[in-house]
């Protein structure tokens, strides 16, 4: 992924308190690889900003150089910033670390708007509230970049979890997860809670505010709420899911499922919006206007640009409807559903009204590259990337803005027919032509 | 051709209310493409936005006038209403209704402005 | 807040000259800027909306240029009728309420 209509960094508001958490509705223990229960040293580990990534600190090198580095299911290349650049604080120098080695290869990763490119090498990683370990890695030294790094987001690299298919410059180049399996008993299973605000935050607060949580190596119960529900990865590369159904409050979009996985649908923290395809956003957009038609607003707030503002705390979260995305189950002919609300789609914005005012965009957008379900899906739930079992899970946070009057939900088992015939078969081409943009 | 028109007292005693009501001539206030609001203008000072509202009664004011401000909308009658509660003579003005279309993003059409005296 | 600064507050010219107004916001509006003119005595008009969008029935002399933070209003050649005051207003942040606080154009 990288930061076109990235994703939204709203750091987050702490769970409840243990006691008022709801209670599990089944045991899924015995399903569950990796560690159980409680990963204290891993929770809060995430920061941000509002639009701008949720980054984690890790360490490079010997002696140890600290960054921040963007979390992005939507990529597979480590890369951190080598060289100076007017936005950024920090970056890693590798001729101060004894353990650097030069892969004498070079790497360019253009994006739709933007690109980075740089050198390889490896060297000795880790990562300070994750797993007590140090692993050697693939490290790409971003040299030079276009439209990469952004202005005051405090991170100078990107973390890519996905597959070894989309690295650069080639599969061949082993992504950083895969080392760290690899090379110590870490179970091949990582989750992440994103946390959003759900008001807008000022310069001093965004800075200060937990982000939320990545879970290296197993699931924290203290995360979620509920049950986890699983929908099976169709293919190793993105983590690619298969969506079945799209209702808006209830109602069915009622289009050829295959349209709402055209020509991919995935999971990608490092992007911010729900991106959906052409077809699938205009129904969407037609919808939403319906429910909310009791206020108009402008053109230009439903293609993300405008922002629209009410009196602080007065925004009508009743007027707006919740979307509900159905996921191929892990059983036959089953799914199951996640519902987000308008306090995940309507992302604050700050710093454009008055501190009298909330200001929001609107964060559903379209999409020519199939559906991404980024922060603004993310960030109502706890999302398990379960590697070992070929699945992800979702299950809702802890931590997810919601209202007194509804709240974001995992509901199941539905009976769901053909859900195979979903999915999009992309006609081979060379792997040249993938998109790497996903602004 | 659709026409505004604003009507109501030209003097107003201070800590009273301001009323005014504006007539939509040559088309629906109805009209789902469009805001309908209020701006006002000091003697030799620039523009300032009071608050908007929508057919359903949906508003928006000021933040720095919202306390003492209220819009409403008769569409029987084709007509919106502002009141203003508790006025000094810092309230004086003239006082527009505009009509907020393209997109309904801006002010594309305007009444010919009434000037409101606040005076004991 | 975001706040728009016009510039020059005023403008003295003659009929037959180009004029040139700049406003400038304190951030991004992306293209969602519209300019006005105020006749003395009269209503204002909308003549620009969408940073370089003619109002209907707005004469070809009058465009709008700029994106993002810095907007220009150009008046190819003065009309004795365009002696009058020009404001500009910001849509990014809805409903519209941001105004500039003017340029006069008189004559010289």
């Known amino acids: 992924t990288h930061l076109g209509i990235r994703l939204p960094l709203r750091s987050g508001l702490a769970g409840p308190p243990l006691g008022l958490r709801l209670p599990r509705e089944t045991d899924e223990e015995s399903e569950e690889p990796g560690r159980r229960g409680s990963f204290v040293e891993m929770v809060d580990n995430l920061r941000g900003k509002s639009g701008q990534g949720y980054y984690v600190e890790m360490t490079v090198g010997s002696p140890p150089q600290t960054l921040n580095i963007l979390v992005d299911t939507g990529s597979s290349n480590f890369a951190v910033g080598a060289a100076p650049h007017p936005f950024l604080h920090r970056y890693y120098q590798r001729q101060l670390s004894s353990t650097y080695r030069d892969l004498r290869k070079g790497v360019y990763v253009p994006y739709t708007q933007g690109k980075w490119e740089g050198e390889l090498g490896t060297d000795l990683v880790s990562i300070p509230h994750g797993p007590n370990v140090t692993v050697r890695a693939n490290i790409a030294a971003i040299t030079e970049s276009d439209k990469f790094f952004i202005n005051g987001s405090n991170w100078e690299g990107i973390l890519g979890l996905a597959y070894a298919e989309i690295a650069r410059p080639d599969d061949s180049l082993e992504p950083f997860f895969d080392s760290l399996v690899k090379q110590t008993h870490i179970p091949n299973i990582f989750s992440l809670q994103l946390c959003g605000a759900g008001f807008p935050l000022n310069q001093t607060e965004a800075l200060a505010s937990v982000g939320g949580s990545m879970i290296i190596g197993g699931i924290d119960h203290s995360l979620y709420t509920g049950r986890l529900w699983y929908t099976p990865i169709r293919r190793e590369w993105y983590y690619e899911v298969i969506i079945v159904r799209v209702e808006i409050n209830g109602q069915d979009l009622k289009m050829d499922c295959k349209e709402y996985n055209y020509d991919k649908s995935i999971v990608d923290s490092g992007t911010t919006n729900l991106r959906l395809p052409k077809k699938v956003f205009e129904a969407a957009v037609k919808s939403i206007k319906a429910a909310s038609s009791t206020e108009k607003f402008p053109d230009g707030f439903w293609l993300g640009e405008q922002l629209v503002c009410w009196q602080a705390g007065t925004t009508p979260w009743n007027i707006f409807p919740v979307i509900s995305l159905y996921l191929m189950g892990e059983v036959t002919n089953q799914s199951f559903r996640i519902t987000i609300l308008p306090q995940q789609y309507l992302r604050p914005v700050e710093d454009v009204a008055t501190s009298q005012d909330d200001c929001y965009k609107f964060a559903v957008s379209q999409s020519s590259t199939g559906t991404v379900m980024g922060a603004v899906i993310m960030e109502g739930f706890y999302v398990v990337f379960d590697r070992a079992r070929k699945r992800i899970g979702f299950a809702v946070s802890a931590c997810h803005v919601h209202d007194e009057f509804r709240t974001a939900a995992v509901e199941g088992p539905f009976v769901t027919a053909d859900m195979e015939d979903c999915g999009y078969n992309i006609p081979q081409t060379d792997e040249s032509t993938l998109m790497t943009g996903r602004a | 051709q659709l026409q505004l028109q604003e009507s109501g007292p030209g003097l107003v005693k201070p800590s009273e209310t301001l009323s005014l009501t504006c007539t939509v001539s040559g088309g629906s206030i109805s009209s789902s493409s469009y805001y309908w609001g209020w701006i006002r203008q000091p003697p030799g000072k620039g523009l300032e936005w009071i608050g908007s509202?929508?057919?359903?009664?949906?508003?928006y004011y000021n933040p720095s006038l919202r306390s003492r401000v209220t819009i409403s909308v008769d569409t029987s009658k084709n007509q919106f209403s502002l009141k203003l509660s508790s006025v000094t003579a810092a309230d004086t003005a003239v006082y527009y209704c505009v009509r907020v279309g393209h997109g309904i993003s801006y002010f594309d059409l305007w009444g010919r402005g009434t000037l409101v005296t606040v005076s004991s | 807040e975001i706040v728009l600064t016009q510039s020059p507050a005023t403008l003295s010219l003659s009929p037959g000259e180009r004029a040139t107004l700049s406003c400038r916001a304190s951030?991004?509006?992306?293209?969602?800027l519209a300019w006005y003119q105020q006749k003395p005595g009269q209503a204002p008009r909308l003549l620009i909306y969408d940073a370089s969008n003619r109002a209907t029935g707005i004469p070809a002399r009058f465009s709008g240029s700029g994106s993002g933070t810095d907007f220009t209003l150009t008046i190819s050649s003065l009309e004795p009728e365009d002696f009058a005051v020009y404001y500009c207003q910001q849509s990014l942040t809805w409903p519209p309420r941001t105004f500039g606080g003017g340029t006069k154009v008189e004559i010289k």
């Open positions: 951030q991004s509006v992306s293209s969602y």
């Open positions: 509202i929508y057919r359903s009664g949906s508003t």
